[in-house]
């Protein structure tokens, strides 16, 4: 197979015919050294998935349910290109499965038992698989056959295409359960009509169904959406209140050696030449031979799926949960409202060991999951492999953009017993230099810089945000002669100063000696000219407070702060000499786990928090000999957020604006994936 050939998998004679036409037309418009199409015919989409996994084909377009099959082992395929619908300016690659109710009803998602339900059709995504998959563990046992369990859960339903003889209750609202538009309650509009007419109490449809059926806002205002956290929202707020986000139609490829760049090059060229309204001879998004061949006829074009986005992230936690429940038919032994152990995400092996010790001391109420970077941990929380972790504000922003929520804040200044209910204002992000140097904020160009990590608040977002507004470009590695900013590209000058050891050089975790607040300060002590840290870093690592060899003889007076007005001040004066106020670190979790995490952590800190005085012979949650493992070592307590329970409210408008501005310089693959 030539290196530049993409072997497209076709699943019918008609698809194979269109594929050959696709191949011939691409050959006519692409240079000889460009990508080419080859066609492979298989009997079904599942056969195509297996063929791609076995390297007998390279690509196929799949519906969401099949993307799930493609991702499962041993297939291990991943999404590489998404079809989009709507306009190029506002491309839609996903739709949202929602539960719509009338505003004047008064039940929540966890009170659906005994209600009347309207579905688009048996086995359909938004109308059946997702809602029934998510409700699966609440269905009465035995849960097989599924239709019987659903019939016994709701007091009456309309499920088009169901067997009305065996399951009459599923057809109670639409006698016969007709499987076409002859049934007035069939498909999306039909299910909504079933609710509108008062036949049903809830309709399981797409987010767009309401808008397509009710042009008038006043009419739409008579309806609400049921959210998974047992609240309701207006029908406009479907992005924050849905059962699952469903990808429409996706090209998949192998995770390793999958030719994704070549596939994108091919499809990007294809949409330029043969996309909507581009050519009379061949049309990518229609065919005289049949409907939806190779691609959906309703598609308007393609978008490249960000490389960090694997199938789990692409399909989303709710969708995968629903489909897995339906397919595997397994439910937890504990009732769903009971808090299972909370899985903490630990960064690399140092944090993992502290987490394990916590796990033992919590008698297994805490379990541990590991990842090599903070972004990998956030991704694990998103997909349910982990539940929570504590994050610097810069990562609270990324986690928030990825759908996670802040749960508790680390407090550093408020003594107990008021600590748990106090909202602190934050800490100061400062620039530290040696007293012996002549540096000021205005002559940092060409100097050696030390950062906690890329994407973190005091070490990156605040100083680089300020720098960006001064230099108006993102080439920070050219501004400083060299530095250590863990998480930078390995060949960047901002990795040159890092200490490693070797395979971990410049990695954004504790394996890199210059990572974090203490690491950045150590970098200043040993190699650098300026360190961007929190205001407490110098006092916490001088005067013998840090017993490590590099720190034990350091004196506080040998370091000073740079002020934005060009002056310098003592490290004792951060209130009058700082770069900005930074939001405290905070614990984040998925919305569905937030209450559990909060309850458990408040309980854990009562046992292992700052009230424990002897940490040499007792487990202490907020102690790790200046290494800030799992939590900052200067944490006094974890505090309730009260109404600051979204990332925007928690971080504050000013900080969110600063980080959003810096996004044009973003090197965060996760942020790119979460904003896709």
């Amino acid at each position: 197979v030539p290196e530049k050939s993409v072997r497209w998998c076709a699943v019918s004679e008609h698809e194979a015919t269109k594929c050959q036409s696709f191949r011939d037309h691409m050959k006519s418009v692409l240079p000889s050294n460009g990508p080419s199409v080859a066609c492979v015919k298989k009997a079904s989409h599942l056969d195509c998935i297996r063929a791609i996994a076995a390297n007998e084909a390279d690509a196929v377009t799949l519906d969401a349910g099949l993307v799930y099959d493609a991702y499962l082992a041993p297939n291990n395929l991943k999404p590489v290109v998404a079809e989009f619908y709507g306009s190029k300016e506002d491309p839609q690659t996903f739709y949202y499965a929602v539960a719509v109710v009338k505003k004047d009803s008064d039940f929540q998602m966890n009170q659906l038992r005994g209600r009347k339900s309207c579905h688009t059709g048996l086995g359909r995504s938004a109308g059946w698989n997702i809602p029934i998959g998510l409700l699966y563990c609440d269905l009465p046992e035995p849960r097989k056959p599924l239709e019987k369990a659903v019939a016994n859960f709701f007091s009456g339903s309309c499920v088009p295409c169901a067997d009305g003889t065996d399951f009459p209750q599923l057809c109670q609202l639409c006698p016969g359960c007709g499987c076409s538009t002859l049934n007035q309650y069939f498909s999306y509009s039909g299910a909504f009509k079933c609710l509108k007419d008062g036949a049903g109490d809830v309709a399981f449809v797409k987010h767009s169904t309401i808008f397509e059926n009710l042009a008038n806002k006043a009419d739409r205002d008579q309806y609400e959406l049921l959210c998974l956290d047992n609240t309701r929202k207006s029908v406009d707020e479907y992005k924050d209140c849905h059962l699952a986000r469903v990808p429409s139609h996706t090209v998949v490829a192998r995770s390793v050696g999958g030719k994704e760049d070549l596939i994108w090059e091919l499809l990007n060229q294809a949409q330029e030449h043969f996309g909507k309204d581009k050519s009379k001879e061949f049309q990518l998004f229609s065919s005289p031979h049949g409907k939806d061949l190779l691609f959906k006829d309703s598609a308007h074009g393609f978008l490249k799926v960000p490389p960090r986005m694997d199938a789990k992230m692409y399909l989303g936690y709710e969708y995968i949960t629903a489909i897995r429940n339906l397919r595997e038919g397994t439910c937890p032994e504990a009732p769903t409202d009971e808090c299972k152990p909370v899985k903490w995400c630990a960064l690399s092996h140092h944090e993992r060991l502290k987490c394990d010790e916590w796990s033992v001391n919590s008698a297994g109420k805490i379990e541990c999951e590991s990842a090599e970077t903070t972004e990998d941990c956030i991704a694990k929380i998103m997909n349910g492999e982990a539940d929570a972790m504590s994050l610097d504000g810069g990562f609270v922003y990324i986690a928030g953009m990825c759908g996670l929520v802040p749960v508790l804040a680390e407090n550093y200044n408020t003594p107990n017993p008021n600590c748990e209910n106090t909202a602190e204002e934050g800490y100061f992000a400062v620039a530290v230099v040696k007293s012996s140097s002549d540096l000021t904020w205005d002559n940092l160009k060409g100097k050696k810089s030390c950062h906690t990590a890329v994407g973190r608040t005091a070490g990156w977002n605040i100083p680089m945000g300020l720098l960006y507004s001064k230099i108006n470009h993102c080439r920070f590695d050219e501004f400083f002669s060299e530095g250590c900013a863990p998480g930078s590209e390995k060949n960047s000058s901002l990795c040159k100063l890092c200490m490693g050891p070797s395979p971990n050089l410049c990695e954004p975790n504790n394996k890199e000696g210059y990572y974090g607040y203490t690491g950045a300060f150590r970098c200043l002590v040993e190699k650098g000219d300026v360190a961007f840290v929190k205001h407490q870093t110098v006092p916490q690592n001088t005067g013998g407070k840090n017993p490590d060899a590099w720190a034990k003889n350091l004196k506080e007076e040998d370091y000073e702060l740079l002020c934005l007005d060009g002056s310098r001040k003592s490290v004792q004066e951060p209130a009058n000499c700082h770069l900005a106020r930074a939001p405290n670190h905070a614990v984040v979790a998925r919305k569905d786990k937030a209450d559990c995490v909060q309850t458990l952590l408040l309980d854990q800190q009562r046992m292992f928090g700052s009230s424990v005085t002897d940490c040499s012979s007792n487990f202490c949650l907020f102690e790790s000999k200046t290494k800030d493992l799992l939590f900052r070592d200067d944490t006094v307590c974890l505090a309730k957020l009260h109404d600051r329970n979204t990332y925007e409210k928690y971080l504050g408008e000013e900080y969110v604006k600063a980080v959003t501005n810096l996004r044009k310089c973003s090197t965060s693959p996760l942020l790119e994936a979460c904003t896709f």
Epitope: L353, V360, A363, S624, K627
Partner: nanobody
């Protein structure tokens, strides 16, 4: 820092038992948490079982009901009783007091357990 020496490993048939011991050169009475870890070839080191000074224990899901951790403060020793051994339990087993391991990354020599017919 406390010096720890593991012993008691060996070759055993599936379904068999072994008792591992970990002797501390200092007093373990002042140490809070002790734990057994294992590392199979090409895999990450993983927590098997842990015990606090007050006797709170926790176990990895894969060993629950088969392994029992205990400690004898008077003898400065921690034990791991392993019953119903399976081939997948084959690994080098290490014990730790945590106080040194998560800062200096200090580990003893470990003791090899091989489960094979």
């Amino acid at each position: 820092q406390v010096q720890l020496v593991e012993s008691g490993g060996g070759l055993v048939q599936p379904g068999g038992s072994l008792r591992l011991s970990c002797a501390a050169s200092g007093s373990i009475f002042s140490i809070n948490t002790m734990a057994w870890y294992r590392q199979a070839p090409g895999k990450q080191r993983e927590l098997v079982a842990g015990i606090t000074r007050s006797g709170t224990t926790t176990y990895a899901g894969s060993v629950k009901g088969r392994f029992t951790i205990s400690r004898d403060n008077a003898k400065n020793t921690v034990y791991l009783q392993m019953n119903g051994l399976k081939p997948e339990d084959t690994a080098v087993y290490y014990c730790t007091d945590y106080s040194s391991s998560y800062y200096q990354d200090y580990w003893g020599q470990g003791t090899q357990v091989t489960v094979s017919s």
